[in-house]
Interface confidence: low
């Protein structure tokens, strides 16, 4: 570690005196710069010497000597005071810049250590410090404002009591810069714009930043627009607003508009699309199939997407029949706006009743005219089954009627014993009717089919069951003969599969 002669750590001299500072080390040594022109620097063997023949208060500061070859990187320092009775302060910098919440060193060095007891920090022209200014003083370094705030960016003077009067330093300007967390915040309004050719339009690009040093511009496709900028300050932020006003839009005004703002932290941009159309438009669509099938008792939401400009002047859901003249309850109709020109309209149909099957139409109107979108709603029903004994052309016949939607298929079962329903263990024969006769098939209604089982005699100890099923469910009806007779069999023309 190098050694400084005189040994220090402080040396007090008067103006005009000769001062010699010698630094000696094991190897070559050097003084930390920059050394002011008032000093003469020369080498004397392994030592480096700083000397001045006419010390002034401006020589007041700490001088540090290092030994570059020392692996431990040791250094030695001495603080020189040149106590000038007219100049209590040596100011090393007229301007200090820090970020908020950093400590700010105001480098006014006291030229006479005796004066330390009477020092204070004031704002320019002796004004007091702002409240909550927390500071400390070091005669070697100056005043430190701890955790400086933006509002403390002011002109300061260091004050010392000399012979009963306060003597000020020259002023030091402290600049406290706000810590910029990121690029400016942006808004571009509207997020989307549609206009008919000849209409007026306005696009507003605004950016805000915590300090005034930021730029903002509005760009149309790849062209930067020259728009006057309005500046403001509120909510502790600087605002810059660009407003593009178009009296009569044309197709060349259409396209992508980008609002771009930048500061030292980087760039931020947001875009919108401006569409210019020849005339009003109104488009209805649905992501759903327009033909809907729902099981009775369940619920359904019908959704329509509307794209329109200008805005809608009217809209409603209408039930077109065929079952009743009821209309959808308004409380079941819901409208949500996805954005300015796109809307979703929903009709909720909970716990559907048979009378609610049919056509539902959504109608909308704007200056472009009327449009409608119609859904066809068919209800699904599980089969209902009934069996009767009848005589057809002199032959005894079991007649099974099954009603449901979708159209039920029919299966006959013959099983041993008397039972409400044949189970697999009891089944003696199975016949599937491939083409039951359709008795009725009206839109939005159940399909009724009929299947015949011709029997010469029915055995009294057996059960004949008609089963019908569709995608919703199944139904069955068991028939038990009352008197004994010959065993039944399927007629040839039935083409049943055993």
């Amino acid at each position: 570690i190098p050694v400084i002669e005189p040994s220090g750590p402080e040396l007090v001299v008067k103006p005009g005196e000769t001062v010699t500072l010698r630094c000696v080390g094991n190897g070559s040594v050097e003084w930390d710069g920059p050394i002011s022109p008032h000093w003469t620097l020369y080498s004397d063997g392994p030592s480096s010497v700083l000397t001045t023949n006419n010390a002034t208060f401006q020589n007041t500061r700490t001088y540090r000597c290092t030994e570059p070859g020392d692996p431990l990187g040791g250094s030695a320092a001495i603080h020189l005071y040149v106590k000038d009775p007219a100049r209590p302060w040596n100011v090393l910098a007229k301007e200090v810049v820090v970020f908020e919440d950093q400590d700010a060193l105001l480098p006014c060095l006291l030229t006479d250590p005796v004066l330390e007891a009477g020092v204070s920090l004031v704002r320019l022209r002796g004004r007091p410090l702002l409240r909550h200014t927390n500071y400390s003083f070091s005669p070697w370094h100056g005043f430190i404002i701890h955790r400086a705030k933006f509002i403390q960016g002011q002109d300061y003077q260091c004050s010392a009591l000399m012979g009963g009067r306060k003597v000020m330093s020259i002023s030091i300007r402290l600049k406290v810069q706000k810590v910029i967390p990121g690029p400016p915040a942006l808004t571009l309004v509207p997020a989307e714009l549609v206009r008919i050719r000849g209409e007026a339009a306005q696009i507003v690009c605004s950016a805000s930043n915590i300090d005034v040093d930021f730029d903002v511009f509005l760009q149309h496709n790849t062209t930067k627009l020259a728009i006057p900028q309005r500046s403001d300050f509120h909510d502790n932020r600087y605002q810059k607003v660009l407003t593009l006003s178009l009296g009569q839009v044309d197709f060349q005004h259409a396209g992508n508009y980008s609002c771009v703002a930048s500061n030292v932290q980087g760039k931020h941009s947001t875009s919108m699309f401006f569409q210019v159309v020849e005339s009003a438009y109104l488009d209805l669509s649905s992501e759903q199939n327009l033909i809907q099938e729902v099981t009775v008792g369940e619920g359904l939401n019908l959704k329509v997407m509307v794209e329109a400009y200008p805005g809608l002047q009217g809209f409603n859901w209408t039930y077109l029949g065929p079952f009743s003249d009821h209309q959808p309850e308004p409380k079941l109709a819901n409208a949500t706006t996805k954005d300015t020109y796109r809307h979703t309209f929903t009709l909720s149909l909970p716990r559907l009743k048979p009378s609610e099957a049919g056509r539902y139409s959504f109608l909308a109107r704007n200056p472009g005219g009327w449009r409608a979108l119609t859904f066809e709603l068919t209800l699904r029903y599980p089969p209902e089954v009934s069996v009767i004994w009848t005589s057809i052309n002199g032959s005894g016949t079991l007649l099974c009627a099954a009603s449901g939607y979708p159209q039920p298929n029919v299966t006959w079962l013959q099983c041993a014993g008397h039972t409400d329903r044949c189970d697999e263990a009891q089944v003696l024969q199975v016949w599937v009717d491939p083409h039951p006769e359709v008795l009725s098939q009206e839109p939005f209604q159940k399909v009724t089919v009929q299947s015949l089982l011709t029997a010469e005699t029915l055995e009294h100890n057996q059960t004949y069951e008609c089963r019908a099923h569709n995608s919703v469910g199944s139904g069955s009806w068991a028939f038990i003969p009352i008197s004994a007779g010959a065993r039944t069999h399927p007629p040839d023309e039935f083409l049943f599969t055993p």
């Epitope: 401006q58 007219a86 100049r87 007229k94 320019l124 022209r125 002796g126 002011q154 002109d155 003077q157 009067r165 306060k166 003597v167 000020m168 020259i170 002023s171 600049k175 005034v212």
Partner: antibody, heavy 126, light 107 residues
Framework: EVTLKESGPALVKPTQTLTLTCTFS??????????VGWIRQPPGKALEWLAN???????YYNPSLKNRLTISKDTSKNQVVLTMTNMDPVDTATYYC??????????????????WGQGTMVTVSS | DIQMTQSPSSLSASVGDRVTITCLAS??????LAWYQQKPGKAPKLLIY???SLQDGVPSRFSGSGSGTDYTLTISSLQPEDFATYYC?????????FGGGTKVEIK
Amino acid sequence: EVTLKESGPALVKPTQTLTLTCTFSGFSLTTYGMGVGWIRQPPGKALEWLANIWWDDDKYYNPSLKNRLTISKDTSKNQVVLTMTNMDPVDTATYYCARIGPIKYPTAPYRYFDFWGQGTMVTVSS
Amino acid sequence: DIQMTQSPSSLSASVGDRVTITCLASEDIYDNLAWYQQKPGKAPKLLIYYASSLQDGVPSRFSGSGSGTDYTLTISSLQPEDFATYYCLQDSEYPWTFGGGTKVEIK
């Protein structure tokens, strides 16, 4: 008595370098807190600050011209020199030097131009 | 950079009139403002410093006021020798910037 006087060529050609000298008396630029600045004024237009130099050789430049300006001082001759490179016809103006000061103990420093030279008209033309 | 917007750019007044010139800074300049008077063919002359302090030798009819971003130069009773162009200068932050000037003419 404080006086300042600008000197330099009345006519320079485009792309040439302008060198202006401010010779002053009545104060010293070695005095603690003292400074000298340059200001210009195009014909019929407002004043524009160019550069300052302080007693401790601290220098400040107008960022819009920083790459073209150099300010220096010769305290032994009581002179401040401003050079401006790559002159253009838009640089046609009256160029003034002015003193910044003085520091009055124990009052505040006066950071303003309190004494001005008479100005020198510089025309940039080919 | 701090912009200094001076208004009006020109005004016509008569001897004895009270004249007010304003300077608006684009951000707070903490009273770091001076006012200068310039007559045709002459160098500017310092009238007011630190927004409101009168320079030695300047008549007391000149006064300065204001704070934050808004500053005013007032001539309480215009004299024949006061017809000139007036400039404000901020030194709150580099680069120091002047206002655009206000020309005071005889009505």
